[in-house]
Amino acid sequence: AVNGTSQFTCFYNSRANISCVWSQDGALQDTSCQVHAWPDRRRWNQTCELLPVSQASWACNLILGAPDSQKLTTVDIVTLRVLCREGVRWRVMAIQDFKPFENLRLMAPISLQVVHVETHRCNISWEISQASHYFERHLEFEARTLSPGHTWEEAPLLTLKQKQEWICLETLTPDTQYEFQVRVKPLQGEFTTWSPWSQPLAFRTKPAALGKDT
């Protein structure tokens, strides 16, 4: 038997992936556990193996189909269960009726690149990955720039209230190393949250021209 509090949180990436994290206080160390997805109106069901991410939490990704296929809609309800092996049988450790479009978290933006860099400014572009066509262009972004001597947590957030997959960073210091990250969020869903931050993009501003005012 397992005592202690349990938390089971899942998000839908809006296309063909449900990512889940299960935490359990009185942790089961060497037990095999999985997440099972059973939709109320689809012919498929799916399972993924929970793998440890920390002392008392496990994670896995339910792959529902090809990355850009639209596998669920607003009317789907998916019963998600955490099942752990106890001897020869499986025990239900957690269960939820999951409404995918109320629990959205998109994939992190990808393909970040420097389009143009100068002494004081830098133009950066990115792409979104596996976002549903239902959203069309109605997404918002947050971006942040890491300056020398600061932490990511100290970086001010820049908000883009539309599907703008580029940004022009200004008032930068010449010949300075920076890093840049961006994340995305749809408008839909009561429990929807920001995507993970993108992989950081490192860039360096151009040095100021010698003998010129900067």
Epitope: R42, K71, T74, F101, E136, H138, L187
Partner: nanobody, 119 residues
Framework: QVQLVESGGGSVQTGGSLRLSCVVS????????MGWYRQVPGKQRELVAD???????KYADSVKGRFTILRDSVKNTVTLQMSSLNPEDTGVYYC?????????????WGQGTQVTVTS
């Protein structure tokens, strides 16, 4: 402005058939589900059948094998072919569409069409 227009209701005898149609029109939208609900006096509106993207149809137990739902997501139409009708199928039938407009999802309803089955 989004509009749902239903047609095809009427009176029919027990064992007969009817075909209900609904078309969604209006400003820019994407539909992810369309279906039919019915309401009888003194009761809540209940699902008859609907069809979501991916072709998954859902039917009320009482109509399985008798009713067939067809959805054209390009023309934004949904039809309900009803056969072997009985008096319990009497009621006002409402078309419902789940529509994505400017990044948010909402449900839209038609005005309803009366179906009467007499014995």
């Amino acid at each position: 402005q989004v509009q749902l227009v239903e047609s095809g209701g009427g009176s029919v005898q027990t064992g007969g058939s009817l075909r209900l149609s609904c078309v969604v029109s209006g400003s820019h939208f994407i539909s992810d589900v369309m279906g039919w609900y019915r309401q009888v006096p003194g009761k809540q509106r209940e699902l008859v059948a609907d069809m979501a993207d991916g072709g998954s149809a859902k039917y009320a137990d009482s109509v399985k094998g008798r009713f067939t739902i067809l959805r054209d997501s390009v023309k934004n139409t949904v039809t309900l072919q009803m056969s072997s009708l009985n008096p319990e199928d009497t009621g006002v039938y409402y078309c419902k569409a789940g529509l994505w407009i400017t990044g948010r999802h909402s449900d839209y309803w038609g005005q309803g069409t009366q179906v009467t089955v007499t014995s």
